[in-house]
Amino acid sequence: ARNGDHCPLGPGRCCRLHTVRASLEDLGWADWVLSPREVQVTMCIGACPSQFRAANMHAQIKTSLHRLKPDTVPAPCCVPASYNPMVLIQKTDTGVSLQTYDDLLAKDCHCI
Amino acid sequence: ARNGDHCPLGPGRCCRLHTVRASLEDLGWADWVLSPREVQVTMCIGACPSQFRAANMHAQIKTSLHRLKPDTVPAPCCVPASYNPMVLIQKTDTGVSLQTYDDLLAKDCHCI
């Protein structure tokens, strides 16, 4: 049976959105990004126990086969289901420009 | 620098498509699927070293932060980039029917 959003491992242990503070240096962006100096990076972290936030049928299959063949088939993995856009002020050959990135910050998470 | 599809861990060790043979019993489908009796499940398995098949900017960020904080931020994970459709012959309340599933078999893989 699917347990949806209930984490059997205890609160906060399963796949969910986390925020990690990172500087431009941490991200390797110091040479091409001017702002922001620091990013609150939202990312998906946590375990994916049986049927927890299963993204689709493939994730359900993966759970079943991982149970049978744990050395061959890995458990589903916690990844972004969608993203929030973010703007960066960046250096270009012609000066400074504002660029929007649609695939940078995780918005919500699922297991796949 | 991105190394794209070159696996630094050795041939076949990085994120790629694998085929795993599974019966209806293995998948927990025996009570609702009549055919096929066995499925060649294609799934994404393997390591995601730095920038290998990075799906997007988020994956690149994850690689950078994993290098800095390996205990906090996991490495990118090998997941389907797209899927191949598959049909199942299934039992329903009204009889047997053919159903197409678009999210069952991985077609190709990337790291995220």
Epitope: - | S35, P36, R37, P85, M86, V87, I89, T100
Partner: antibody, heavy 118, light 112 residues
């Protein structure tokens, strides 16, 4: 909605090659588990399975006719083709194409009639 | 090839009464996996065949539940509990245990 439609020459002379086309919609021949088969039915008689082709390009031919049959597909244009070499009067029949999903043969075309006559 | 044997005609039936159509195979259609690979089709006058019964006993979705099927490995019966005018046509049994799939010669359902 799944539909299949057969087309063919209608009339052939003995020793000619029969070329049949099955044009279909409502499903894709790139879907795992899907195939298209050809079945024929002489007037007032039973059904005979000729050949089928699967999503992965695996093919099957009825052993009794294998040397004369060629099946192929054009997945992007939703078409399957069957050629029968050196026809004779015994090949006079209605030819059907049908969608297969494993052993589930659920949708048939309306058939195309072939008459072999000198 | 497996030979499927059917009587050419059924006993004439009255509308609203039950009818039975028999079929015999030259070899058992019961596979070691427990499935009996026997199918029933109806070809109405001027139409192409339609699948009624899948794997011996499974009614296809959309087929009236007046139809049912049973049998052993080699002897099979299709039953129509309350015959309606639209049931008139030729009933074919078929096997798909072995290639090529083979059909019976068909049994014509006749009304009194």
């Amino acid at each position: 909605q799944v539909t299949l439609k057969e087309s063919g020459p209608g009339i052939l002379q003995p020793s000619q090659t029969l070329s049949l086309t099955c044009s279909f919609s409502g499903f894709s021949l790139s879907t795992y588990g899907i195939g298209v088969g050809w079945i024929r039915q002489p007037s007032g008689k039973g059904l005979e399975w000729l050949a089928h082709i699967w999503w992965n390009d695996n093919k099957y031919y009825n052993t009794a006719l294998k040397s004369r049959l060629t099946i192929s597909k054009d997945t992007s244009n939703n078409q399957v083709f069957l050629k029968i070499a050196s026809v004779d009067t015994a090949d006079t029949a209605t030819y059907y194409c049908a969608r297969l999903a494993y052993d589930y043969v659920d949708s048939w075309g309306q058939g195309t009639t072939l008459t072999v006559s000198s | 090839d497996i030979v499927m044997t059917q009587a050419a005609f059924s006993n004439p039936v009255t509308l609203g009464t039950s009818a039975s159509i028999s079929c015999r195979s030259s070899k058992s259609l019961l596979h070691s996996n427990g499935i009996t690979y026997l199918y029933w089709y109806l070809q109405k006058p001027g139409q192409s065949p339609q699948l009624l019964i899948y794997q011996m006993s499974n009614l296809v979705s959309g087929v009236p539940d007046r139809f049912s099927s049973s049998g052993s490995g080699t002897d099979f019966t299709l039953r129509i509990s309350r015959v309606e005018a639209e049931d008139v046509g030729v009933y074919y049994c078929a096997q798909n245990l072995e290639l090529p799939p083979t059909f019976g010669a068909g049994t014509k359902l006749e009304l009194k």
